[in-house]
Interface confidence: low
């Protein structure tokens, strides 16, 4: 995967939420969900009660990026996705409060967020050439591409 | 069934340092995060910190920062809580508690240690 | 988000129906455990959510409550229910505790 090193002197600052519970299901029409008390999982759904929602913060980056940069909270907690490495899960991670400045390292609680129709994808910042993904039979993890499905519709006003 | 199983009472001097163990079993350790909470007598329970069990990343409360280290044997599902400089006011009866979100936002503890009771006297 | 148990001991007979309240700084939107405590020092998780048994534990415990305040019933009583009886938040960190309410036979 990607090194993170050149991005490590960009700043990125908290601004505002820009979304509120909303759910992320996946090109099969999989929602995700929470596998245990770390990690998430995607599965097909019948009652939409059972999926995560999720909160989404949007932060400025001092290089002025065109991307929207954001973070991506468990509504309700104080539990926030984190990458890891290619291939690996994305992990949950737990902080008294959201960040108002995220740099070097800590970018792997940010993504940048793109839309095409209605398709949405999440890359990572500090991978950039990864996406959060779904993939049969395991957690929700970073991966490049197929087989792991990268594309998400969100879901909004699902509280 | 699930068990937390922890290491027997401690009597140490103060500037000594004491380790405590957690083994877990009848889960995977891995899925669920760990708990370290605090008993001191008469006081209230305290939670001391929280650790991933995938990563061994800790979260520690505010009071608890500085002379505590909380560190993991995964292979052997064991958690563990080191004190150093150990000080009077650490006389207290430790827990290690298993974390679960219920319905993806309450957190809880949902099975626990039988606690080690640690005494620094001099 | 500081947790309130007003009642620091509590007297009762066998067979009694017994309450124990809890107060939560805040509204804690029925994020609020229960535990009981053991006087060998055990503990247990009774009641999540405001109102869900944990497995294994008797129907005779209970709980109810919203918004800041909440309450654990036992609705009758037996001698191995004599403990202390934690309330915990667990809505914001650091999920804290109420004081516990010591349980105590007649």
């Known amino acids: 995967s990607a090194p993170f090193s050149f991005l490590s002197n960009v700043k990125y600052n908290f601004m505002r939420i820009i979304k509120y519970e909303f759910i992320l299901n996946d090109a099969l029409n999989q929602s995700i969900i929470r596998a245990n008390d770390q990690y998430l999982t995607a599965a097909a759904l019948h009652n939409l009660d059972e999926a995560v929602k999720f909160d989404m913060g949007a932060y400025k980056s001092s290089k002025d990026d065109a991307k929207i940069t954001v973070i991506l909270r468990i509504s309700k907690t104080q539990l926030y996705v984190t990458a890891q490495d290619e291939d690996q899960p994305v992990l949950l991670k737990e902080m008294p409060e959201i960040p108002k400045t995220i740099t070097g390292s800590e970018t792997n609680l940010l993504f940048f967020w793109e839309t095409h129709g209605t398709k949405n994808y999440f890359t990572s910042v500090a991978h950039p050439n990864l996406f959060i993904a779904t993939k049969q039979d395991y957690w929700v993890c970073l991966a490049g591409g197929p087989p792991s499905i990268t594309d998400f519709q969100i879901l909004e006003n699902q509280a | 069934q699930i068990q937390l199983v922890q290491s027997g009472p401690e009597l140490k001097k103060p500037g000594e340092t004491v380790k405590i163990s957690c083994k877990a079993s009848?889960?995977?350790?891995?899925?669920?995060?760990m708990n370290w909470v605090k008993q001191a007598p008469g006081k209230d329970l305290k939670r001391m910190a929280w650790?991933?069990?995938?990563?061994?990343?800790?979260t520690y409360a505010d009071d608890f920062k500085g002379r505590f280290a909380f560190s993991l044997e995964t292979s052997a599902s064991t958690a563990y809580l080191q004190i150093n400089n150990l000080k009077n006011e650490d006389t207290a009866t430790y827990f290690c508690?298993?974390?679960?979100?219920?319905?993806?936002?309450?957190?809880?503890?949902?099975?626990w240690g039988q606690g080690t009771s640690v005494t620094v006297s001099s | 988000i500081q947790m309130t148990q007003t009642t620091s001991s509590l007297s009762a007979s066998l067979g009694d129906r017994v309450t124990i309240s809890c107060r939560a700084s805040?509204?804690?939107?029925?994020?609020l455990n229960w535990y009981q405590q053991k006087p060998d020092g055990t503990v247990k998780l009774l009641i999540y959510?405001?109102?869900r048994l944990h497995s294994g534990v008797p129907s005779r415990f209970s709980g109810s409550g919203s918004g800041t305040d909440y309450s654990l019933t036992i609705s009758n009583l037996e001698q191995e229910d004599i403990a202390t009886y934690f309330c915990?938040?667990?809505?914001?960190?650091?999920?804290?505790f109420g004081g516990g309410t010591k349980l105590e036979i007649n």
């Open positions: 009848g889960y995977t350790f891995r899925n669920y995060g």
């Open positions: 650790i991933n069990t995938y990563t061994g990343e800790s």
């Open positions: 805040q509204d804690i939107s029925n994020c």
């Open positions: 959510y405001t109102s």
């Open positions: 508690a298993r974390g679960i979100y219920y319905y993806g936002s309450s957190y809880a503890m949902d099975y």
């Open positions: 915990q938040q667990g809505k914001t960190l650091p999920y804290a």
